[in-house]
Interface confidence: medium
Amino acid sequence: KSSNEATNITPKHNMKAFLDELKAENIKKFLYNFTQIPHLAGTEQNFQLAKQIQSQWKEFGLDSVELAHYDVLLSYPNKTHPNYISIINEDGNEIFNTSLFEPPPPGYENVSDIVPPFSAFSPQGMPEGDLVYVNYARTEDFFKLERDMKINCSGKIVIARYGKVFRGNKVKNAQLAGAKGVILYSDPADYFAPGVKSYPDGWNLPGGGVQRGNILNLNGAGDPLTPGYPANEYAYRRGIAEAVGLPSIPVHPIGYYDAQKLLEKMGGSAPPDSSWRGSLKVPYNVGPGFTGNFSTQKVKMHIHSTNEVTRIYNVIGTLRGAVEPDRYVILGGHRDSWVFGGIDPQSGAAVVHEIVRSFGTLKKEGWRPRRTILFASWDAEEFGLLGSTEWAEENSRLLQERGVAYINADSSIEGNYTLRVDCTPLMYSLVHNLTKELKSPDEGFEGKSLYESWTKKSPSPEFSGMPRISKLGSGNDFEVFFQRLGIASGRARYTKNWETNKFSGYPLYHSVYETYELVEKFYDPMFKYHLTVAQVRGGMVFELANSIVLPFDCRDYAVVLRKYADKIYSISMKHPQEMKTYSVSFDSLFSAVKNFTEIASKFSERLQDFDKSNPIVLRMMNDQLMFLERAFIDPLGLPDRPFYRHVIYAPSSHNKYAGESFPGIYDALFDIESKVDPSKAWGEVKRQIYVAAFTVQAAAETLSEVA
């Protein structure tokens, strides 16, 4: 069958019909519906929402909608024994205690089951000791403290400001530095934009607002008790001592009112430079301990949270493909929230809901996509991407053989300035072409394309007249599909102006103040940015599922491979003497990249010329495109990170949110000058160059003529 036998409408009309059916008013209505009560993973409320979504997706017209459940390790505060932090005097009396909850926003005073701020998976404990301020608790912050300032964090409680890197990396760094507890806080320098009022009068973080979040270092493992395998009814579970990624020291988050009380008394060393100062009226002294009059006072943490194996529920909807039902295009986003989820995740879930409704409308009119589309509402993303990872582990054999693409759909907005896209290079041309066909929602760009406003506001640093597209890192549900399974992936949302707003994320992230009203009053009153994101996400899914030839351009991979090879070579060339001493050469990598470039170019020429009416040849060419991302997977994974298997991209070892290119080589080179055995360290660099060169060459060969 050709794809047009699947439908009585022309392909171009289909896309227009799909996009025209998406309505801002529906997204608004869905967002309201999804945000009236908390939907914390593992709770009855979130199970009920799963069943509601299942029912509505069926009504919208999907072929089947099933719940997929797993029993995974989650973490909750003790309801009768709250978590808090104290300042204690020399007699052990608590002279100051941090708040036990966030003041609820107007209209939500009587809502039950608002989980108080906590760091999910913190162990229990009541450590007490001197405080050390560690800035953002990044790798480089601890280098500054330990190497330059000679400050020892061993046996200390450290206080770190949120921002810049994933909180789990902060905790890992603190553990490695010997700390016995971690306090995380939101500094106004990072979470209070100048000239904007705090919630409920604006979108800034009030002093009592606190960011929740997990502090795991899972490295892609999913459920900590069942790494590599689904947490199903007959699962073998590790003991808690063998669980993957759990922190070993107590951790707790606070707002900036409470942080002020802790930081104002700090003594010891002055901050090393201005980059260690936030916006509170405190000296930002590093410590250790309090100054003069307060030097006998200590900080004490009281953490009583528990880890519990709990049932979670994904919703999986299927729209069967008419021509290639065994090829899957997946649109997935999570449903669970910390509290109301006004932005994270429900601004994304509402968009997915409207995309499903639009596809369902077309299906009811007799249309089907060429390939199967799977829709997913993931659970327990906030607890470590658990729902998506367990489902992918359960279905890995199907996914690695049939997975064409995964499009992520968490928060649709983190600002209202311009589009932000992170994706595989295979999707660059798809994103460019699609955004040229969509209207920009931005003021001052009426009648202009989304591509034009995006390119103006967020230009590529390398290619004139093109928009910036970033690497995929992690911290969201695409991780297992891209980093573990090698399925081409992408994500899109509306973002802030990174040049003028240097705060981290959006100020109310993971706080109780992330409400429907936050979005409706301050971010997107007309829901026009949500609609644009729905068009981008939905349009990508439509094209991926419906185009006769997959809309992947392998030549764009060649371009970035050269860029990444240049970058990693230039990092290595910081050490010219060692490169010479240990005979370190990048020739094999550059040669493989050159071969990839030539073979990709020839493949693209064949792709223009082949007989598209021959279904066998069409399928063969499409399979070469589909399996190209898969070819970058190393079955052995990265050193000490077996579930990060992509050789070109991995989450940074220093910040899970960020992507690193040629991560194996990068990590081998990182801080190599401090390694005790330089011969061994440079041997590992050479091994990683070998792995990368082999993988690029092997991937290139998958694009060669098959015989």
């Epitope: 810049k164 640093p461 970033s470 240049d566 070579y569 230039s570 910081k574 992507g659 290119s661």
Partner: nanobody
Framework: QVQLQESGPGLVKPSQTLSLTCTVS??????????WSWIRQHPGKGLEWIGF???????HYNPSLKSRVIISVDTSKNQFSLKMSSVTAADTAVYYC???????????RGQGTLVTVSS
């Protein structure tokens, strides 16, 4: 916090060479996670990327400007420079230096300096 400041003459005669320097403060130009760019914006137009450099001298240029541009770095002074030869009135623009990386939070740029090409 890292800050970038452009410096150089605001007026250049046609056919001469435009020279600008970017001084980086609050952080080392040797940081391997970043590359250092020159960008320009013609009056009423979008941004045009000129080129970028890694601290050790690995350079990429905009192909349309490659024949006229040299970007260099001086790690000892924490500076990088732009030289553009054979300028014409079409090179009149606000010139920015920028720090970049592969991720969104990496992007910073200076205040910009207006360079007018006129006799």
């Amino acid at each position: 916090q890292v800050q970038l400041q452009e410096s150089g003459p605001g007026l250049v005669k046609p056919s001469q060479t435009l020279s600008l320097t970017c001084t980086v403060s609050g952080g080392s130009i040797s940081n391997s996670g970043y590359y250092w760019s020159w960008i320009r914006q013609h009056p009423g137009k979008g941004l045009e990327w000129i080129g970028f450099i890694y601290y050790n001298g690995s350079i990429h240029y905009n192909p349309s400007l490659k024949s006229r541009v040299i970007i260099s770095v001086d790690t000892s002074k924490n500076q990088f420079s732009l030289k553009m030869s054979s300028v014409t009135a079409a090179d009149t623009a606000v010139y920015y230096c920028a720090r970049d990386g592969d991720d969104y939070g990496d992007y910073l740029r200076g205040q910009g300096t207006l360079v007018t090409v006129s006799s």
